[in-house]
């Protein structure tokens, strides 16, 4: 798979492949995988990809299921790149406060918060 | 501050306090703080709170600015609790695939993706 494929297209294709291979993947129904108990997915990327690794190790490879796991590994690569960009630029307090305000604003409007 | 205050109310109050104390906080013009270069805030919580720590150590405490940093520390506590909940429940493959599909769906529709 060329890594040049836009990440948005990669995500779309992966969703389709996940749907296609669901029956094969759930064949190992006794396997236990960490499933986050909330919907703030971005906080849980580490556990999600650990789970994908566990699932991959228990799934017979070949054909397009291999493409599914390759795609997921490219998505992980993209996310790891995004995480690196969290601390790359050191800027003035002003810019930091803008970002903090934005973060709290998103938390206020978009996060699923259980008290 | 009672930790019993709902997190959603805490976030709202913190946004207001941040606005109130902005002038005081930006007084330190030479300070440099890491600012993420993308808008997927949840991926950067560690860096955001490190930045808050840096800012707190450089800010004269007292009055409601102290309350701002106390609030931010409670928000960090909440997020740390959410992160713990990422791996607490180890469930069947079926539930994991539901979560993965949801995660990719959110990534597809809500993330700010630069290719």
């Amino acid at each position: 798979i060329p890594t040049e494929i836009p990440t948005s297209a990669l995500v779309k294709e992966t969703l389709a492949l996940l749907s296609t291979h669901r029956t094969l993947l759930i064949a190992n129904e006794t396997l236990r995988i960490p499933v986050p108990v909330h919907k703030n997915h971005q906080l849980c990327t580490e556990e999600i990809f650990q789970g994908i690794g566990t699932l991959e190790s228990q799934t017979v490879q070949g054909g397009t299921v291999e493409r599914l796991f390759k795609n997921l590994s490219l998505i992980k690569k993209y996310i790891d790149g995004q995480k690196k960009k969290c601390g790359e630029e050191r800027r003035r307090v002003n810019q930091f406060l803008d970002y903090l305000q934005e973060f709290l604003g998103v938390m206020n409007t978009e996060w699923i918060i259980e008290s | 501050i009672p930790t019993e205050i709902p997190t959603s109310a805490l976030v709202k109050e913190t946004l207001a306090l941040l606005s109130t104390h902005r002038t005081l906080l930006i007084a330190n013009e030479t300070l440099r703080i890491p600012v993420p270069v993308h808008k997927n805030h949840q991926l950067c919580t560690e860096e955001i709170f490190q930045g808050i720590g840096t800012l707190e150590s450089q800010t004269v405490q007292g009055g409601t600015v102290e309350r701002l940093f106390k609030n931010l520390s409670l928000i960090k506590k909440y997020i740390d609790g959410q992160k713990k909940k990422c791996g607490e429940e180890r469930r069947r493959v079926n539930q994991f695939l539901d979560y993965l599909q949801e995660f990719l769906g959110v990534m597809n529709t809500e993330w700010i993706i630069e290719s």
């Epitope: 006794t30 396997l31 236990r32 566990t54 | 429940e89 180890r90």
Partner: antibody
Framework: ESGGGLVQPSQTLSLTCTVS????????VNWIRQPPGKGLEWMGL???????DYNSAIKSRLSISRDTSKSQVFLKMNSLQSEDTAMYFC??????????WGQGVMVTVSS | DIQMTQSPASLSASLGETISIECLAS??????LAWYQQKPGKSPQLLIY???SLQTGVPSRFSGSGSATQYSLKISSMQPEDEGDYFC?????????FGAGTKLELK
């Protein structure tokens, strides 16, 4: 745990686990049993969201439910036989391990 | 189901002696293994989780090790309060399964 004691063969067992200091909506509760002088057998659990998972060996006879307002988890098992004689424990699961256990309740199946 | 084979079934140790209990899984369990201690008439108590992490409040003389299918619990200096039954448990797959237990006695 409560509800133990003597149960007639073929009857239904009903046990209650009352939890204190833990919220059922953010904790998973398991049932585990131990026949006299023997090892431990995992029976099933109720997840924090109310979903259940059972040991396939006894799944057809077992039902786990809860009342979150009373902080209680219930176990119902039908068609009891002498081999169901055991100490029954409820336990909190965390990352797949059982870190808080009830004191246990003895169930004897006999006519 | 994953079978957990524990050995020995019973063990007698002197005060201060180092003892080891083994647990063999019928397939790889990726270190999803716990050890419990149970005293007569009491509930089991979690000692070790994740194959080698010590549960809070458990004395440091207890340690766990192993990977894949082979795991062990070590008590570095036997104490009178260590008497009891010890069980291993896997949580890699459903159903969670336990070893048959090891009875540890003081000589």
């Amino acid at each position: 745990e409560s509800g133990g004691g003597l149960v007639q063969p073929s009857q239904t067992l009903s046990l209650t686990c009352t939890v204190s200091g833990l919220s059922l909506t953010s904790n998973s509760v398991n049932w585990i049993r131990q026949p006299p002088g023997k090892g431990l057998e995992w029976m099933g659990l109720i997840w924090s969201n109310g979903d259940t998972d059972y040991n396939s060996a006894i799944k057809s006879r077992l039902s786990i439910s809860r009342d979150t307002s009373k902080s209680q988890v219930f176990l119902k098992m039908n068609s009891l036989q002498s081999e169901d004689t055991a100490m029954y424990f409820c336990a909190r699961e965390y990352y797949g391990y059982f870190d808080y256990w009830g004191q246990g309740v003895m169930v004897t199946v006999s006519s | 189901d994953i079978q957990m084979t524990q050995s020995p079934a019973s063990l007698s140790a002197s005060l201060g002696e180092t003892i080891s209990i083994e647990c063999l899984a019928s397939e790889g369990i990726s270190s999803y293994l716990a050890w419990y201690q149970q005293k007569p008439g009491k509930s089991p108590q979690l000692l070790i989780y994740g194959a080698n992490s010590l549960q809070t409040g458990v004395p440091s003389r207890f340690s766990g090790s192993g990977s894949a299918t082979q795991y062990s619990l070590k008590i570095s200096s036997m104490q009178p309060e260590d008497e009891g039954d010890y069980f291993c448990q896997q949580s890699y797959k459903f159903p969670n399964t336990f070893g048959a237990g090891t009875k540890l006695e003081l000589k």
